[in-house]
């Protein structure tokens, strides 16, 4: 139970003994941490916790082989060797990271917290922190991608695919960055008196950052896609006075605004929660966040159970090549299994992931 | 002003249930930590247990676990403790305690009710 | 549990004596330490906490020191009104336990 007297942490602000050193807690119990914060601590398994960890393993056994399922569909398929479809693989490759962390947490959770020391107690958040942050920056890197082709006018953009790994190493190293800064000093083992509610080892001050960070994320996103989809819409009513298919430019459009919808409405439902709930957390003392923490956590997970299935499953190539592995068929066509497919039924391919395009002439 | 006032019958029969309450003004109830101490006159202070409105979360010391129920209603500010199955060795003075720090749990109290002798006799 | 042991268990001065009254606890609590002080018939009043610091309104001529195991209140010039019951308590977590009381009486 001994005090470790350390240098201050870059970040943290300790609390000073008279010796004016500061008073760290390294080999404290987590019980320590969780008592001081009034967070429960389970001594045994209750109802919730059961239902929470039954439901928690389910839906990390379905992020990963649905994600692992998104990796090999892109990686078989030469037709989705392009950089948008990297981009994609990435992001399954980070949800599929994400299931993996929060299985960790399921064996790590309930009554079982008590057993983690201080640094496998900050290994488990951080494993969740480098996922969930590496699945959002891939999303916005995605919709940038977007941005970009949309404005260029491509089906696909021109970026090589050396830039292309280095957009995913930029996005795997600030993940981990992210997931490492509580362990590496951002933490209240020395400065006990600004310790969390809802995750007793961390600082209030990295609670709002993180929630900060993410909704700031988030916004872009939406102004990204609500740019593209004004811009599109703006093209395709230009577009609808001079040309003889207005009906088939509509529907591209409504497609387009359909899957916006969906992969905004997804990202809000499954993150604005868990997200202002940190925040609450610190500003707002009287409210029972701690009532909720379960199961806006569950929320968040489920984005990534989600991803592969609004990025991919509403590509009707996709879908094929998934049948295609699952059925362990091989494909007579090296290019891909739909090569002559009316490509405008495709939605996502042809709204958020491939621009707008139909067939070979250009809608936007 | 912050206040902490503790309330019930001042006379219990052995093996009934003593039921005290802990009603709070001038600062935001569920924010802080409320915890039950008794002084006797053999033992000095004890430390019952403590319950955490904001969450409902409740700590008792070992001893009284099992017998002492803490629970709190945020609408009417109040505190309550339930001790079942006492004994003249439960006699004393019973206050509630505020917790010193918001939103977290010090485990040392800046605020005390005046305290309520509880006599416990047939 | 933490057991509290404090000494002495009553002490007679004078106005304007320096009294130091002493606590130990039975394992490390860091500065994890209050001190109460009690009139009769009164609730018990918080003095200092995490060892050394003092709550406020409280004057100056009290102070606490310590870490880990051992702790002192000090009163560097007694007065009348200082004259009552001291308890100690440690802060570091439940189950809470408090020292058997130090009175201090006038001589």
């Known amino acids: 139970m001994a005090a470790i007297s350390t240098s201050i942490p870059v970040i943290s602000q300790p609390q000073f003994t008279a010796m004016n050193e500061p008073q760290c807690f390294y080999n404290e119990s987590i019980a320590f941490f969780y008592n001081r914060s009034g967070k429960h601590l389970a001594t045994e398994w209750n109802t919730v916790s059961k239902l929470v960890m039954g439901l928690g393993i389910t839906v990390c056994i379905f992020i990963m082989l649905a994600n692992l399922l998104v990796m090999v569909a892109i990686y078989v398929n030469r037709r989705f060797h392009f950089p948008i479809y990297y981009l994609m693989a990435n992001l399954a490759a980070a949800d599929f990271f994400a299931g993996l962390a929060y299985f960790y947490l399921m064996f790590n959770t309930g009554p079982n917290t008590r057993r983690l020391t201080v640094s496998t107690w900050l290994l488990r958040q951080g494993l969740i922190d480098t996922s969930l942050t590496a699945s959002v920056a891939n999303l916005l890197a995605i919709a940038i991608e977007r941005h970009i082709t949309v404005f260029r006018m491509q089906l696909h953009t021109r970026m090589s695919n050396r830039r292309v790994v280095v957009v995913i190493v930029v996005i795997w190293t600030m993940a981990i960055v992210m997931g490492a800064i509580p362990s590496v000093g951002w933490n209240c083992i020395c400065d006990i008196e600004n310790c969390s509610n809802m995750a007793p080892l961390y600082s209030d001050s990295y609670l709002v950052f993180w929630a900060i960070f993410n909704l700031v994320t988030f916004v872009v996103m939406v102004v990204l896609y609500a740019h593209i989809f004004g811009y599109v819409r703006q093209r395709t009513m230009r577009m609808s006075r001079h040309s003889s298919g207005p009906r088939r430019n509509r529907d591209t459009m409504m497609s387009l605004l359909k899957t916006v919808v969906i992969v905004l409405g997804a990202f809000i439902i499954c993150w604005t929660p868990g997200l202002v709930l940190l925040l609450l957390d610190v500003c707002c003392p009287q409210c029972d966040v701690l009532a909720y923490e379960k199961f806006f956590l569950l929320l968040a997970e489920f984005n990534s159970a989600m991803n592969p299935i609004i990025y991919s499953y509403r590509d009707k190539e996709m879908s094929a090549t998934f049948r295609q592995i699952l059925c362990c068929q091989r494909s007579e066509n090296p290019t891909g299994p739909t090569e002559g497919s009316d490509r405008s039924a495709s939605s996502l391919n042809h709204t958020i992931l491939a621009g707008v395009h139909s067939n070979d002439h250009s809608v936007v | 002003q912050v206040q902490l006032q503790e309330s019930g019958p001042g006379l219990v029969k052995p093996s009934e249930t003593l039921s005290l309450t802990c009603t709070a003004s001038?600062?935001?109830?569920?924010?802080?930590?409320i915890s039950w101490v008794r002084q006797t006159p053999g033992k000095g202070l004890e430390w019952i247990g403590e319950i955490y409105p904001r969450s409902g979360n409740t700590y008792y010391n070992e001893k009284f676990k099992g017998r002492a129920t803490l629970s709190a209603d945020k609408s009417k500010n109040q505190a309550s403790l339930k001790l079942k199955s006492v004994t003249a060795a439960d006699t004393a003075i019973y206050f509630c305690?505020?917790?010193?720090?918001?939103?977290?749990?010090?485990?040392?109290?800046?605020?005390w009710g005046r305290g309520t002798l509880v006599t416990v006799s047939g | 549990d933490i057991q509290m042991t404090q000494t002495p268990s009553s002490l007679s001065a004078s106005v304007g004596d320096r009294v130091t009254i002493t606590c130990r606890a039975s394992e490390n609590i860091y500065s994890f330490l209050a001190w109460y002080q009690q009139k009769p018939g009164e609730a018990p009043k918080r003095v200092v906490y995490?060892?050394?610091t003092l709550t406020e309104g409280v004057p100056s001529r009290f102070s606490g020191s310590g870490s880990g195991t051992d702790f002192t209140l000090t009163i560097s010039s007694l007065q009348p009104e200082d004259f009552a019951t001291y308890y100690c308590q440690h802060h570091y977590g439940p189950p809470l336990t408090f020292g058997q009381g130090t009175k201090l009486e006038i001589k």
């Open positions: 995490n060892a050394k």
């Open positions: 001038g600062y935001t109830f569920t924010s802080y930590g």
């Open positions: 305690a505020r917790e010193s720090i918001s939103r977290r749990l010090g485990w040392n109290f800046d605020v």
